[in-house]
Structures are given as C-alpha cells and as structure tokens.
Interface confidence: low
Amino acid sequence: VLPAKPENISCIFYYEENFTCTWSPEKEASYTWYKVKRTYSYGYKSDICSTDNSTRGNHASCSFLPPTITNPDNYTIQVEAQNADGIMKSDITYWNLDAIMKIEPPEIFSVKSVLGIKRMLQIKWIRPVLAPHSSTLKYTLRFRTINSAYWMEVNFTKEDIDRDETYNLTELQAFTEYVMTLRCAPAESMFWSGWSQEKVGTTEEEAPYGLDLWRVLKPAMVDGRRPVQLMWKKATGAPVLEKALGYNIWYFPENNTNLTETVNTTNQTHELYLGGKTYWVYVVSYNSLGESPVATLRIPALNEKTFQCIEAMQACLTQDQLVVEWQSSAPEVDTWMVEWFPDVDSEPSSFSWESVSQARNWTIQKDELKPLWCYNISVYPVLRDRVGQPYSTQAYVQEGIPSAGPVTQADSIGVKTVTITWKEIPKSKRNGFIKNYTIFYQAEDGKEFSKTVNSNILQYRLESLTRRTSYSLQVMASTNAGGTNGTKINFKTLSISHHHHHHHHHH
C-alpha cells in the first residue's frame, strides 16, 4: 500500500537557527521515510532534507540548517513520503520567511514608576539578540495586579533598533504591584516569541483613596456620657498597598459646630464619649501626598427611635462559604452594614464589619472564620445617614464535638426518683450549637438507660428507679458533629422515703 499523501504542511523559521516543517500523518502503518524538497533564493536554488531512515523513520518533521537559510526569501516546500510500495508527493506549499519567522522573547530589565506621573509604570526591555536588525517588532505586553489571576494585554510596535526599548503603561491603579510579561514578533510574522520572564513593578503612591467608617454604640455610663467606638478602614477598591500616616477625626453635636472636637490618631479605632444628643463625626486619612475624601457618620440621639425593616435572616453554608441572607420590608434601603465577631464569654478580641450595597446577602469565605467558633452576625439597614435596628443570628462554619461535657449533680434523691441538674457548657468549649442533652444512667450490674432532652433543658427528673440501688450517670451534650460526656456521678436511691421514715419515728 502506498503511503498516505503528506498533508497539513506547516513551516516555521526559527530566526538564525533553523527552518522546520512538519506534516501529517505523523505515523504510518508501514515503515515510511520522507524527503522534503525545498526551493530557495527566490527559486534559484533547491535542496532536500531527509528524515534519517535508521533513527527517524515515520518522523513527520525535518529541519534545514544554516548556512543555506536565506532571509528575506520565499521558499517552496514539497514533502515526499516513501515506503516499500512506492512514493506519494504532497502538494507544493509556498512560504514567505518574513511571515513565519519566530524570534526569542525580549527581556524586561526595569519596571518602575516615573517620578510625578501617577498611575503609570515604565517598562524597559532589551530586544532579543536574535532578531532581524532592520525589522519592526510587534509586542504584546501582558499585565495583572499581583493578587489577580486575570491578565490584561496591550499591543504595540517598535521600530527602534539595537537599544533598550521603553513602553509607558498608563491608567493603572495607584500604589499597586503589577506583574508584567512581554512577547514579540517581527511585524509581518504569524508566530510570536515565547513570553519573557515575569517582572514586578509598583505604581506611585497617591493621597489615600477613602475610608469606610462604622461605630459600636455602647450603653450610657452613670454620668450620662455615651461611649461610642469608632472604627474605620480603607474603602473597598482602595489600592492594596495604600498606607496612611494617620487619621484626623472631628465631631460636634448636630447644629453646633462651635463645640467641634478634634482628634489625631494613627490607630484605626477610637473611643468617643458623647452626650445624649445627635452627633456628626468626620474622619479623613492622610499620607505624605495628601488627605482622603471625608467619611461621615451620624450618631443618633440617645432617645431617637430607630427604624426596623429586616424581617428574617438565614445563615447557610456552602462548600467553602458562609452565606447570610435577609428579607426586608423597605425596598428603598439598599445599603447594609454587616458586623461579625466571635461569641465568647469575655469581650470579643476581634470585631469585623463590612458594607453591602445593592444586595440582601453577604458572603464570607469559610477560611476567614475559625472553625468550632460561634460567630454573632448582625445586619444593620442604612438609609442615607440613618442606621436602623439590627437583626442578628449566630453561625458556625464548622462544628465539632464539645471539648467538655456538662458538669452534673444529683439532687432530691428519692426511693424511685432523682432530679439531675447540669450546667451549660462554657461558650469556648461548645464547638457547635448544642442540639440536645442525653442522660445515660445504669444500675449497678444492670442495663443502661438513656433519655434525650432539648438543649434548653438543664434539669430532669428520672423516675421508675429501683429502691436502695447504686446508679452511675452522665450527661452527654451533642452538636451536629457528635456528643461529649460530662463527668460521671454516682448516687444511691433511698430504701425508704424521708416522709415514711419520719412517720415511722413518730410511732
């Protein structure tokens, strides 16, 4: 059987290295070898590239090497396939070297901001050594912020030769790290170089972008003053690297700017002690280049009635997120403040908050919250400068079994009854929502019994016990992940009730 006719001939000119053609089929049923016939020097010369019978039979690729690689030039290529039964020739294909030239990648050697020019990086690189001196090169510059996976691209051409090249990349984010990589090709070529080694550069810093501002209102003190914990952070969308030198706060009672107080701090939180009236609070951040826009917050008067519009809220877990959704009776409210912090017996050490706009749900990655910790989550409706009543819920991103069981005691021991009481497990040891308690009790050398009660019950009366019998008992607290037994206690039912005992004495 004759070999298949070579098809899909594809050639590429690796500048100053080789001219390589490939074709299909790559494998023949029977042993086949190939000849590649070339005409070059615009048709004045011809030669042959053969695949080596011994080592490279059936290998659908062949390379022509210097010094017979002429450039610029037009080549014709025809591939002959031969086996024991005969020869099959391909169609003749035509190749303009300028259109199929592939060169080495350029090399970026500098990525830096230019003093005084904002949101720009100047990229400098060296043209590949192996690139035709006379040709215009086209370039693709790929760039992304350092913590993004999404590449952006810009295309341009350069005609300069034999010098370090420059490109100014504009309209970037301020004070942000960017990753750059560059590729090039002769302007007429369909083949691009590989990508250069990635390099990183940082745009110039600017005055801070802005602040998100929030507060926690605490109960009024005995002297009538109200502690208000102010907190602020870089606004959503601010450059990751942005740093403030400090923050200026000023505040005054509504309609009385004469009583303005000012504070300067380098912290991102500050406690104010306010009177009972409505107050206005303003915060700006600043660095060596200027101030951010002003963040404003209204602190309501002590006796002000706040609106309520959240009717229900659900927290649910997906594969890797905690999603909180809420329903509202006020369609005009489109901004919400979400607070979350660990529910611990002491003052919470970490308090987090985030603004949500144009949505009635909030999502957080599970790995941002600690497993086995209960979180209090509150959502406040915000309508212009007014903050409404919060709606709160609790959630665990991962439950475990309690790290301790309930501490239990036996009270009111009778002939056939006993009352068991136990203490709630401390919050730090629950590791999940306590679903229920199970009382396990067993008479000496007897069968074990159990009784399960709801999590809001901390006392239970066991009945139908056997008189004058020793029992062992423990209470297990269970979460969705499983249960943990508390301390084991022992008690003995009475032989005769106290009531009968006393009565007997009277006789």
Epitope: I108, F109, S110, V111, V114, L115, I126, D164, K199
Partner: antibody, heavy 119, light 107 residues
Amino acid sequence: EVQLVQSGAEVKKPGASVKVSCTASGFNIKNTFIHWVRQAPGAGLDWIGRIDPANGNTKYAPKFQGRATLTADTSTNTAYMQLSSLRAGDIAVYYCARYYYVSSYFDVWGQGTLVTVSS
Amino acid sequence: DIVMTQTPLSLSVSPGETASISCKASQSVTNDVTWFRQKPGQSPKLLIYSASNRYTGVPDRFSGSGSGTDFTLRISTVEADDTGVYYCQQDYSSPWTFGQGTKLEIK
C-alpha cells in the same frame, strides 16, 4: 542582613582566566539582577555587564563581550564573573552589585575583589 | 554608548558651604540617573536614584535634580565626612555608563 560577599584577591599571569564569586545573603538573587563593575587603580567605574539569575540571561558592555562570562547558581545564591585572556589593563578591583528592577538602582555592593595580572 | 561627563573633576569646599556637581549625558536619559559616593578602599554607596530620590538613610543635605541630559547633585552644609569621589551613572540604555567621578575635598 542583606549583603554580597566576594571571593578573595587573585594574582594571574597574562593570558590566563580569573573567576570571581559573589555570594548573597539576606535575599534571593533570583529576584534581582547582579551587575559587575570594575575600577582600575586611581580610575573611575566601568560597567562590565549583568545577569538575571532567574533565567541566566546576560548583557555585556561591548568592550567585554566575548571575554567576560557571567553565570549564577541559584542553589547557592552565588553569582560568578569570569574574565579570560587577561592582560595588564585588566588590573582592577571587580565589584558585584545588586540591581533590583522594581526600584531600579544599585543598592547593595560587594566589598570588591582585587585582580592583579603579572608575569 | 551614552557618555556621562562630570564637572568639575575636583572640588574643594569649606564646612558649612554648598557643593554642586554637574553631570551631562550625551543624549537624553530621561530621569534614569543615580549618584554614588565612594570613599578610599570602600565600595560605592548609593545616594540618589531616579535623578532626585534620596535613598533610605541618606541625609536631606543631599539632593538631586535634573532630567533629560543635565543633572546636578547638591550637598548643602557640607561636613567633613562628605569627602570622597562622587559618581553619576545612567541606567537608561545599556551599556550602563558612569561619569569620570568628582573628588570632593573639605578644606
């Protein structure tokens, strides 16, 4: 502490080669370029070339092209400069320097290695 | 190659005075100029980068200015410790080149 420590002084015969090492501590040379500069006695600074240790790419001043060879071993955090066909005019202190492409300046220099060529 | 020409080649200044060193590039190097000081037996030390940015820890008595082809290093209120040879260097285009150096002497 961020520093570059170079190998000790060398005495070579004309026509021989010399290889100077430059070992970095406190940073990874893969994240920088290492440049080499020489200074003849009583003279100014003369740029030899540079290497990107991340990929081995080099760039040489035309006057050193073909005679200087820059290499780097990222496993030992060390860069090397080899100069061949030594002659009397190569007597100089050879410095390596770190050039960090983000800030674009030579901020850390080696202590220098004196190379003497004498028959 | 870009030639960096420094003037003067030597300079003698009394303590408290201002010293100025000029550096001229044979073609525009935008602001890609660095200034170093070298004391006898020591490696060069970075003073100014990108023509006008003071390197960390360099006293504010040192300032750089200029762009394109003309650059200046100024040392105000000169102190005895400021002696040494000062070099400008361009990293606009390779091969990177240095000025010949200016020797500053304190009277």
